[in-house]
């Protein structure tokens, strides 16, 4: 009986339904390729339920396998622009703790102006995800063109 | 004991597992950029479990955070075709109720013939999702090239 | 009481949380367009929880609706290379049992060097998924550039 009752009383977060969808806040200074994210209902349709933002980077609060997804669109971009400024590359990875640093997802824009992808990956409490955009083109800040999110899938 | 028993008796839909995967039915008349979708086992591998179709547009039946995904491929397309007829753009958004109208996901084809993306977004019961394809190229109706779906993720 | 207790004792797999994320092992011999996959913690961040590998192809162990996702990047590729070697196409499908053979997801590279997509599809125990890469370019074996996975979503 206790387990059934406990289930009724547990907040959603304790069921492992950690999820976040972020919108672009700003890019870093010149030598910092990281994108800085923001989230919360006041900003539109972005949110954090479980994970947190640490100086614009996403920090995981629950161990598990996550679906990580991202879309980045380059600002004022045409296929000509994109090819001229090649290579522009986006990489999503664990950037801290340093001992767990690894690239999880990498895409180049080539002659396109948008990249979008997703993957399943194990993440641990305390992992911070960074999204590095290398190249001389700026990402669009439109919330329907550039976004980044994670979804807890299973322990 | 009641909760455990109730769980055993509840249909899947009541657990919040709403999900749909749709295939292209047809495009709209010239001044209507919307794509019209269809779904159901008789049509192949498309289905609706929870959400419904309203005149070819997807209507949400349960509040929650959803993973929305889409792939659209242009018919008889090469990179030359795609670049010549730029801009061809796909946007997924809430089109009704009007008070909640917003673009959720937007991609341009540039020199490519396929776009594919996904995002997490809060949706409410009664929200209708529209997929607008602007441009003068037709979307492929092949079920492995063009599809649109949603998956309930959490309340 | 029994159901609640049973829930506590059931392994995750019995809850239907089947999930796999694979990395590229190798390509097939010349006349075989299939990509051969591998997975497991010893290899990095790939894993199989439920599904199994059968000679490098992914075999499903539980009926249900799955989210299938894939990213493939071509090795030593530029937009010039990609367009010159066009058409390079990736298709994900059920390849056995033969009675259920069908293409689920298809993308061409055109002038790009990466394709990434995802879709929801019903799969049955025993279905084997094959990923066919046609063309004369090799896929990258970098684990952040080429990967393939499935996630059980609902019965």
């Amino acid at each position: 009986q206790r387990f059934a009752q406990a289930q009724q009383q547990l907040p959603l977060e304790s069921l492992g339904w950690d999820v976040a969808e972020l919108q672009l806040n700003h890019t870093g200074p010149q030598q910092d390729p990281r994108l800085y994210w923001q989230g919360g209902p006041a900003l539109g349709r972005s949110f954090l339920h479980g994970p947190e933002l640490d100086k614009g980077q996403l920090r995981i609060h629950r161990d598990g396998i996550y679906m990580v997804h991202i879309q980045v669109t380059l600002a004022i971009c045409s296929s000509t622009t994109a090819s001229r400024h090649h290579p522009t590359t986006l990489a999503v990875g664990i950037c801290s703790p340093a001992s767990r640093s690894i690239s999880l997802l990498r895409l180049s824009f080539h002659q396109g102006c948008t990249i979008a992808s997703q993957r399943l990956t194990p993440l641990a409490r305390g992992d911070t995800l960074c999204t590095n955009l290398t190249g001389t083109l700026l990402p669009s800040r439109n919330t329907d063109e550039t976004f980044f999110g994670v979804q807890w899938v299973r322990p | 004991q009641r909760f455990a028993q109730a769980q055993q008796q509840l249909p899947l839909e009541s657990l919040g597992w709403d999900v749909a995967e749709l295939q292209l039915n047809h495009t709209g008349p010239q001044q209507d950029p919307r794509l019209y979708w269809q779904g159901g086992p008789a049509l192949g591998r498309s289905f609706l479990h929870g959400p419904e179709l309203d005149k070819g547009q997807l209507r949400i039946h349960r509040d929650g955070i959803y993973m929305v995904h889409i792939q659209v491929t242009l018919a008889i397309c090469s990179s030359t075709t795609a670049s010549r007829h730029h801009p061809t753009t796909l946007a997924v958004g809430i089109c009704s109720p009007a008070s909640r109208s917003i673009s959720l996901l937007r991609l341009s084809f540039h020199q490519g013939c396929t776009i594919a993306s996904q995002r997490l977004t809060p949706l409410a019961r009664g929200d209708t999702l529209c997929t607008n394809l602007t441009g003068t190229l037709l979307p492929s109706r092949n079920t492995d090239e063009t599809f649109f779906g949603v998956q309930w993720v959490r309340p | 009481q029994r159901f609640a207790q049973a829930q506590q004792q059931l392994p995750l797999e019995s809850l239907g949380w089947d999930v796999a994320e694979l990395q590229l092992n190798h390509t097939g011999p010349q006349q075989d367009p299939r990509l051969y996959w591998q997975g497991g913690p010893a290899l990095g961040r790939s894993f199989l929880h439920g599904p199994e590998l059968d000679k490098g192809q992914l075999r499903i162990h539980r009926d249900g609706i799955y989210m299938v996702h894939i990213q493939v990047t071509l090795a030593i590729c530029s937009s010039t290379t990609a367009s010159r070697h066009h058409p390079t196409t990736l298709a994900v499908g059920i390849c056995s049992p033969a009675s259920r053979s069908i293409s689920l997801l298809r993308l061409s590279f055109h002038q790009g060097c990466t394709i990434a997509s995802q879709r929801l599809t019903p799969l049955a125990r025993g279905d084997t998924l094959c990923t066919n890469l046609t063309g004369t370019l090799l896929p990258s074996r970098n684990t952040d550039e080429t990967f393939f996975g499935v996630q059980w979503v609902r019965p």
């Epitope: - | 018919a75 037709l138 492929s140 092949n142 090239e145 | -």
Partner: antibody, heavy 120, light 111 residues
């Protein structure tokens, strides 16, 4: 409404060239490519080629390469086709045509045709 | 190039009856879930007029007595009931690839 107005009939001697025109009106000229089609008794309808009214890019039917040259003048919303080294085989009605809304080559809009007669 | 073969070359149909014209392609003109095959009507001294596009779609302003069907390599234009003003030559055309080609034409005469 969309209109394609072609130049008048031409009677020309063998071996010379002729340049015929097609002026578009009732729509944004640079929005849609223009196609040229030949109609003769011997060969029914034959597609000659297409020219982008936006940037002048062309695609020719292999059979008409060296015979036809398509050009465009955006300022006057006019497309031209020059036929070189004329022979009796080139005697035909030449139509310009335009696609409809979708960018695939079927033709709801046609010019009235230009009759070219090659005669000594 | 894709060759389109029309049959018959000519036919005479009584007023109110059904006219059926066939168009066969040397290879499939279907792709991406569409059939890129179109039908035109041409009367003497006039340019061709589009009747049907993508095998079965009626062009705006064309009477509903015209209908098209088929996929792959075999296509049909039906006119029912035939009216006096339908006397003309009918052409099929594909746009599956460059160059687009036309059928040889079918001349419809009203008896």
């Amino acid at each position: 409404q969309v209109q394609l107005q072609q130049s008048g009939p031409e009677v020309v001697r063998p071996g010379v060239s002729v340049k015929i025109s097609c002026k578009g009106s009732g729509y944004t000229f640079t929005d849609s490519a223009l196609h040229w089609v030949k109609q003769s008794h011997a060969k029914s309808l034959e597609w000659i080629g297409v020219i982008s009214t936006y940037d002048g890019d062309t695609d020719y039917n292999q059979k008409f390469k060296g015979k036809a040259t398509m050009t465009v003048d955006k300022s006057s919303s006019t497309a031209y086709m020059e036929l070189a080294r004329l022979t009796s085989e080139d005697s035909a009605i030449y139509y310009c045509a335009r696609r409809g809304y979708y960018d695939y080559d079927w033709f709801p809009y046609w010019g009235q045709g230009t009759l070219v007669t090659v005669s000594a | 190039d894709i060759v389109l073969t029309q049959s018959p070359a000519s036919l005479a149909i009584s007023l109110g009856q059904r006219a059926t014209i066939s168009c066969r392609a040397s290879k499939s003109v279907s792709a991406s879930g569409y059939s890129f095959l179109h039908w035109y009507q041409q009367k003497p001294g006039q340019p061709p007029k589009l009747l049907i596009y993508l095998a079965s779609n009626l062009e705006s302003g064309v009477p509903a007595r015209f209908s098209g069907s088929g996929s792959g390599t075999d296509f049909t234009l039906n006119i029912h009931p035939v009216e006096e003003e339908d006397a003309a030559t009918f052409y099929c055309q594909h746009s599956r690839e460059l160059p687009p080609t036309f059928g040889g034409g079918t001349k419809l005469e009203i008896k």
